[in-house]
């Protein structure tokens, strides 16, 4: 089978030195030296398919996969990673070998998987599969911390089951929204695992290792404020704990509060109170609801009551699995070069997602944001409107959640023009895509306004570089144009830009370009 | 029994305030939510926010939002509701209505007798 | 916002006749998994405040006639008066409690014919 081409798989381990860190290249960073992946045909494969060694990877390690093949000719080549095309771009080393790389910057666990490499060469087509998995570094795990009530003392006592054990601490704060962000002068922290102050407004419980960092928060309805005007969701999944504070502050001790499911009081050992007086001589009553650990028939209505304040509820659902719900369907957005523009994707999710945004191979870190109605939203404004493809990627324990993103910038046609001897093409990347002329400039014409119709051909968006469309026209050379300057404009409804191309002429093409407005 | 008791009409000129009183006997003032509600002639009926008389918090309707201020005095189980900047689109009859909470926060079981605010120059 | 529409905007029947109100909402106010609807409707007559009839789609308020039903659920819902008699002539409105802010159908004015 000599047709096929010699092809070479490596793995290169990055030295985490920050200075890579962002960089997405088709060139090895400072490396150790490079593994040799094997690359075995797949027997019984549909197609041709080689197949490398797993890759296994510390967490925020830095590799590159790399493939180096010995074919004659040009090669062109296609990424995929869950079922997301990745722009390739192949280069050709010093013994005119075609490398193709995929670099992985700080790996995590979303960068884990299959990539799949299409290459098309001139003479065969073939799949190359690389399997990366995250090394089983003494099955670390960090897992979301949860409540319990520390025997007979009113305390709740924060668990994370992790590896390696995890450093666990109470995040406190005492006023509303927006100062109980993390590094607020209101933000208290207690690196403990049992807490008795239990009175506080916001009371939440994290817990770190070398994976990073998880934090649950203990889901608080306080009969003093307005309830938000979408009840309150808390999703769970079967078999984990539950755990509902209701506050009520008033001006002596003569209330009482109750917790009732769907109009029937809680049995008893599902619930504890606590109360205290405050600084301005008020008492303050907490009323716990639990069940340490949930099935089905516990979902429904949760309803804190008083005798002197309002009723609240929050709807708590049993889920078997977690998920993420959001509309998968992909996006284009249409923006002016200076615009002010953020995609947005709105999710509702349990248990809470990870999740990155890609463009071109670079990953940029994902924020959320909590919004009042049980959705959450993750933004990212970041693009520098670079027109393409955008990718945003979540999962969570249970699910994983893909949605595209395309972004258009309206601005005026840049052309670039090649030629050879017997064709002139120019290429443009403006949008909205543009349209094409050729003129040819002569004695007749100086002003090259002689339109040339014949032998001209173009093509809309022949070439995707990250989701971003090149439109292209060539001319075919024909006699009656050998030896003439020609024009060609590439128009939209911002604009004009052209290239003169001197056709026939020996040694480089004399590109002369001008912009018309 | 259950009575929500709104102050009398009030005449009033564009760019004035208005504040409109609601007293409460019957049952525990500090139990219920209390939401304002308006009706401009012949018209349908519009939410303008909800108050928690027990803590004194508010939440408003994004549209009155900066205009209106809804508060309460426990010690005689009154709301108010002051509307500034008035226009003559804000002529309306005004309600009080009482909510029940819990899971069924939103919806009203008494009203007030309502208070009809003119706005006209 | 949740916009409620009804139809008719009246209608006229014969006393003892049964008279149907449709309400429809913009979204879905039905809240998994409890599949509960939040959605009241509203009695007004002239010159009063309106009077609670109906809540959660199909909870009669009490002290409210048993010829006043409510049913429906997810975005559509309807009112509907089993045998009119002459005290029911009101303006009706539905109003959504699901999300902020809450807001009222324009209303249907119910005649006898």
């Known amino acids: 089978n000599q047709d096929l081409p010699v092809i070479k798989c490596v793995l290169i381990n990055h030295k985490n030195n920050d200075s890579s860190v962002g960089k997405s290249s088709s060139y090895p960073m400072v490396s150790e030296s490079p593994e040799d992946l094997g690359c075995a045909l797949r027997p019984q494969s549909s197609g041709t398919v080689y197949e490398a060694a797993a890759v296994e990877v510390d967490v925020s390690a830095s590799i590159t996969l790399q493939v180096l093949v010995d074919a004659p000719g040009n090669i062109s080549c296609l990424w995929v990673f869950k079922h997301s095309s990745l722009n390739c771009q192949p280069h050709f080393d010093l013994q005119n070998r075609g490398v193709v790389s995929m670099v992985i910057l700080k790996m995590t666990e979303t960068q884990a998987g299959e990539y799949l490499l299409f290459i098309q060469s001139e003479a065969t087509n073939y799949t190359i599969l690389f399997t990366v998995s995250i090394r089983n570094t003494l099955l670390y795990t960090l897992r979301r911390p949860y409540f319990r009530k520390m025997e007979n003392q009113d305390a709740l006592v924060c668990i994370s089951e992790s590896v390696p054990e995890p450093i666990v601490e109470w995040v406190l704060c005492d006023s509303q929204g927006e100062s109980c962000k993390e590094e607020s002068p209101a933000v208290v922290k207690k690196e403990e695992k049992v807490l008795h102050e239990l009175f506080g407004t916001d009371i939440r419980c994290c817990a770190r290792n070398e994976l990073g960092r998880e934090c649950t928060r203990l889901f608080t309805i306080d009969l003093n404020q307005t309830p938000q005007t979408t009840l309150p969701q808390l999703f769970l999944k079967v078999g984990e704990p539950l755990w509902i504070r209701c506050k009520a502050v008033h001006v002596n001790h003569g209330f009482g509060l109750t917790w009732e499911l769907e109009n029937k009081a809680l049995e008893e050992g599902n619930y504890f109170e606590m109360s205290t007086y405050s600084t301005n001589r008020t008492m303050i009553r907490i009323l716990f609801a639990f069940v340490s650990s949930v099935a089905r028939n516990d979902t429904g209505y949760y309803t804190c009551s008083s005798s002197k304040h309002p009723s609240q509820s929050a709807l708590v659902t049993i889920v078997e699995k977690g998920f993420i719900n959001a509309t998968n369907s992909s996006e284009d957005y249409e923006i002016d070069q200076y615009e002010e523009f953020c995609f947005s994707v709105r999710f509702k999710a349990y248990p809470q997602i990870r999740c990155t945004w890609t463009f071109s191979r670079k990953s940029f870190p994902c924020e959320q944001k909590g919004l009042d109605n049980g959705y959450s939203i993750s933004k990212f404004c970041n693009h520098k409107h670079q027109p393409g493809e955008y990718i945003f990627h979540a999962e969570n324990d249970d699910a994983q959640f893909t949605k595209m993103f395309t972004l258009n910038i309206r601005r005026k046609p840049q052309v670039l023009a090649e030629a050879s001897a017997s064709q002139a093409s120019c290429f443009s990347d403006g949008y909205p895509l543009p349209s094409w002329t050729w003129k040819k400039c002569s004695d007749k014409s100086p002003n090259c306004t002689e339109e040339i119709t014949e032998g001209v051909w173009n093509r809309k968006a022949n070439r995707k570089v990250f989701g971003q469309w090149v439109s292209s026209s060539t001319l075919n050379m024909s006699e009656a144009i050998k030896g003439f300057l020609v024009k060609c404009c590439a128009y939209n409804s911002l604009g004009t830009s052209c290239e003169t191309i001197l056709l026939n002429s020996p040694g480089p093409f004399p590109f002369i370009q001008d912009n018309i407005s | 029994q259950v009575q929500l008791v709104q102050s009398g009409a009030e005449v009033k000129k564009p760019g004035a305030s208005v504040k409109v009183s609601c007293k409460a006997s019957?049952?525990?003032?500090?139990?219920?939510?209390m939401h304002w509600v308006r009706q401009a002639p012949g018209q349908g009926l519009e939410w303008m926010g909800i108050?928690?008389?027990?803590?004194?918090?508010?939440s408003y309707a994004q549209k009155f939002q900066g205009r209106v201020t809804m508060t309460r005095d426990t010690s005689t189980s009154t709301v108010y509701m002051e509307l500034s900047s008035l226009r003559s689109e804000d002529t309306a009859v005004y309600y009080c209505?009482?909510?029940?909470?819990?899971?069924?926060?939103?919806?009203?079981?008494?009203w007030g007798q309502g208070t009809l605010v003119t706005v006209s120059s | 916002d949740i916009v409620m529409t009804q139809s008719p905007d009246s209608l006229a029947v014969s006393l003892g006749e049964r008279a149907t109100i449709n309400c429809k909402s913009s979204?879905?106010?039905?809240?998994?998994?409890?599949?509960?609807?939040?959605l009241a409707w509203y009695q007004q007559k002239p010159g009063q405040p309106p009077k609670l009839l109906i809540y959660?789609?199909?909870t009669r308020e009490s002290g409210v006639p048993d010829r006043f039903s409510g049913s429906g659920s997810g975005t559509d819902f309807t009112l509907t008066i089993s045998s009119l008699q002459a005290e029911d002539v009101a303006v009706y409105y539905c109003?959504?409690?699901?999300?902020?802010?809450?807001?009222f159908g324009p209303g249907t004015k119910v005649d006898i014919k």
């Open positions: 019957g049952y525990t003032f500090t139990r219920y939510y």
């Open positions: 979204q879905s106010i039905s809240h998994s998994p409890n599949t509960r609807d939040y």
């Open positions: 108050i928690n008389p027990s803590g004194g918090s508010a």
């Open positions: 959660w789609a199909s």
């Open positions: 209505a009482r909510d029940l909470g819990g899971a069924a926060a939103g919806y009203f079981d008494y």
């Open positions: 109003q959504q409690y699901y999300s902020s802010p809450f807001t």
